[in-house]
Interface confidence: low
């Protein structure tokens, strides 16, 4: 679709005569008829296949024609066409004399023709005017012409239809050749595809408008490059969505089981050394002078009964001092000046001479100890309590106070986490060093088999277009991670439908 435009500029008829030579009375009131048709080697009569147009009376005899285009007038003359411009044409311009006001052909005398010119040739679509002048013996006509495309038509033949648009079907303006030029922030054949925020992850992010970055399920962050860990993941991270990879010192499905109680809680006091011994369990090795599960109790140095052979212990600011009984000497009263002849063994102990009678050794009966069998046996001396249990003397017996998670006379037994039957729906319980594990029957899941599940949500391969399926363990539903170019809960839709009608 386009327009052939003809701009009449000047007509000269100095003598004011008709084509027949007869003069016009009082002068030649001149109007023009224009016929545009297909190319003919010899321009001949016949239908004006590309259109016709007539002017009103433009002047008398000789006159210049005013450019009226800005005021909505009729110069240049417009010959619209609704087909592909062929590039060639024939043009007939007739100048007529109008004796009266009726310009219809049938109202004019047959000899009212002043002049007739016919041209033919090729003409490309363009903004530039072609200037021409045709002279006969009596008249001269100066004019120019061009072909331009109608609004929304482009290309060498005005055959390319293009309307600028900025909606669901495209975001573009039209170039002179009719090709699309995308508006800023849009790309693709029809400028339908938004250009996402710079750096937006190609697979994990997408956008519905420019400079946006919307995350696919399982991803987060401004650029959708951070995975979302499993719902409930406490001390863990992920490298793909819904994972829960535990930080150092944490364990369990949700990384909520403390495997490094020492570091996270620092339970040992007074400079003691802490050792992890299982989930939420630890052992403190006390520095000299301290005792208790957490080395929280300060020891008197005499509490360890350092004085032997019945020596009495005196606490001092910088330690202790042993007061030895008669016949003994040394820091701990460990040296004897006695021999078996002095009956040094108490509580029925038997005396044995050593080093040719220079000193002796007592062999003590049960329940007594010491160099001279002078001490009742302290049942806690051998530290019989296992797993960090605290030994307590209770009269003639002893007992172990066990730390959480242990039981038995000597704290030698783990408390069975399975004793409480924690696995629901008939799950089988397994005691582990750091807790327990439930093996669930078909149809149930969760740490304690508490979640009812029909089947693995991904088992039916619900995701399309080679998307990755993840089972969300907290809801037992599936999530599809779409490959680039697809969206939808099952990745079933291509991103961005091309346009309908791009204008």
């Amino acid at each position: 679709s386009g327009v052939f435009q003809l701009q009449l500029q000047e007509f000269i008829n100095e003598r004011g005569v008709l084509a027949s030579g007869r003069p016009c009375e009082p002068g030649c009131r001149t109007f023009f008829r224009v016929c545009l048709k297909h190319f003919q080697a010899v321009v001949s009569p016949g239908p004006c296949t590309f259109g016709t147009v007539s002017t009103p009376v433009l002047g008398t005899n000789s006159f210049a024609v005013r450019d009226d285009s800005s005021g909505g007038g009729r110069n240049p003359l417009q010959l619209p066409f609704n087909f592909t411009w062929p590039g060639t044409f024939s043009l007939i311009i007739e100048a007529w004399h109008a004796p009266g006001d009726d310009l219809r052909p049938e109202a004019l005398p047959p000899d009212a023709l002043i002049s007739k010119i016919a041209i033919q040739g090729s003409l490309a679509v363009g903004q530039n005017w072609l200037l021409d002048e045709q002279t006969s013996t009596l008249t001269r006509l100066r004019y120019s012409y061009r072909v331009i495309c109608s609004d929304n038509y482009y290309g060498d033949n005005c055959s390319r239809l293009c309307k600028k648009r900025n909606d669901h079907f495209g975001h573009y303006v039209c170039q002179p050749d009719g090709n699309l030029s995308c508006l800023p922030g849009w790309t693709g054949e029809y400028c339908q595809q938004p250009i996402c925020l710079s750096g937006c992850h190609e697979q994990n992010g997408y956008c519905s408008k420019p400079a946006e970055c919307l995350c696919r399920p399982g991803w987060q962050g401004r650029l959708c490059n951070e995975c979302i860990p499993h719902n409930g993941c406490r001390h863990g991270t992920c490298s793909t969505p819904w994972q829960c990879t535990c930080d150092e010192g944490w364990g369990g499905l949700f990384c909520d089981q403390d495997l490094n109680y020492c570091t996270h809680h620092s339970p040992c006091k007074n400079g003691a050394t802490c050792s992890n011994s299982g989930q939420r369990s630890y052992t403190c090795t006390c520095r000299p002078g301290y005792t208790g599960v957490d080395c929280e109790l300060e020891l008197s140095e005499c509490d360890s009964n350092p004085c032997r052979n019945g020596g009495s212990c005196k606490d001092q600011e910088d330690g202790y001092h042993c007061l030895c009984p008669p016949g003994y000497y040394g820091l701990h009263c460990e040296h004897s000046t006695l021999s078996c002849a002095d009956s040094p063994c108490f509580n029925g102990g038997s005396c044995r001479e050593r080093n040719q009678g220079a000193n002796y050794a007592c062999e003590c009966p049960p329940n007594f100890t010491g160099s001279n069998c002078e001490k009742k046996v302290d049942r806690c001396t051998s530290n019989p309590c296992a797993n960090g249990g605290q030994c307590l003397n209770r009269g003639p017996s002893r007992m172990c106070r066990c730390r959480p998670g242990f039981t038995g006379t000597y704290c030698e037994l783990h408390v069975s986490d399975c004793a409480r039957n924690p696995c629901a729906h008939g799950g089988t319980c397994h005691d582990l060093e750091n807790g327990l594990m439930c093996t669930c029957p078909a149809g149930f899941s969760g740490r304690r088999c508490e979640v009812r599940t029909s089947i693995d949500a991904c088992a039916s391969s619900p995701c399309f277009n080679r998307a990755t399926c993840y089972t969300d363990l907290s809801t037992d539903t599936f999530v599809c991670n779409c490959p680039y170019g697809f969206v939808g809960s099952r990745c079933e839709f291509p991103v961005g439908l091309p346009p309908s009608f791009p204008w």
Epitope: L161, K163, R165, N166, D167, H168, F169, Y190, P494, L497, P498, P499, S500, F501, P502, W503
Partner: antibody
Framework: QVQLKESGPGLVQPSQTLSLTCTVS????????VSWVRQPPGKGLEWMGG???????DYNSALKSRLSLSRDTSKSQVFLKMNSLQTEDTAIYFC????????WGHGVLVTVSS | DIQLTQSPASLSASLDEIVTITCQAS??????LAWYQQKTGKSPQLLIY???SLAGGVPSRFSGSRSGTQYSLKISKLQVEDTGIYYC?????????FGSGTKLEI
């Protein structure tokens, strides 16, 4: 000049399938989309669906389960298939160039009756 | 789906009068609204596209305007040939939707 012409049966039995063809000339349907619009007697216009330049489709939510659009670009034809017809599907069916819808066919009257 | 609420359903006016028909969109559809005139037994004819642009060959007494999500078609100096039903259409997002129509009698 752009022209669109609908063709198909004027009478369809209830519960049967309607098949209509829209023949487009003067423009390429592999670039421009074609929509179907219908108008029951004495009622307003209803957009049924469209098939776009690349062959992808969109449908009116209420007709989605029954409606299918396809095309043959070599013949410049767009096809409408709608199943399970009822008397309320009696209407004039127009095809139109999608976008501003400034080119329309004359429409074809389809009567659903036994 | 985007709804278009068109009003009034019908109106009667005299020659040379001015009438206004409105269409309210349920969502922001930008300028992607068109107005059509349909005469009895004929296909709809595009009057206004892009909310405000006059289609080719349509008299200048027809004009379109927009205020937020409300769109208006104004016809000044009514002529006999303006009798017909007028529809609005949103083509911002598929599924596209038409207004319910306004019947204009002169």
């Amino acid at each position: 000049q752009v022209q669109l012409k609908e063709s198909g049966p004027g009478l369809v039995q209830p519960s049967q399938t309607l098949s209509l063809t829209c023949t487009v000339s003067g423009i390429s349907i592999s670039i421009y989309g074609v929509s179907w619009v219908r108008q029951p007697p004495g009622k307003g216009l209803e957009w049924m669906g469209g098939i776009w330049g690349d062959g992808s489709t969109d449908y009116n939510s209420a007709l989605k389960s029954r409606l299918s659009l396809s095309r043959d670009t070599s013949k410049s034809q767009v096809f409408l298939k709608m199943n399970s017809l009822q008397t309320e599907d009696t209407a004039i069916y127009f095809c139109t160039l999608s976008g501003d819808f400034d080119y329309w066919g004359h429409g074809v009257l389809v009567t659903v009756s036994s | 789906d985007i709804q278009l609420t068109q009003s009034p359903a019908s109106l009667s006016a005299s020659l040379d009068e001015i009438v206004t028909i409105t269409c309210q969109a349920s969502l922001d559809i930008g300028n992607w609204l068109a107005w059509y005139q349909q005469k009895t037994g004929k296909s709809p004819q595009l009057l206004i596209y892009g909310a405000t642009s006059l289609a080719g060959g349509v008299p200048s007494r027809f004009s379109g305007s927009r205020s937020g999500t409300q769109y208006s078609l104004k016809i000044s100096k009514l002529q006999v040939e303006d009798t017909g039903i007028y529809y609005c259409l949103q083509h911002y997002r598929a599924p596209f939707t038409f207004g319910s129509g306004t019947k204009l009698e002169i």
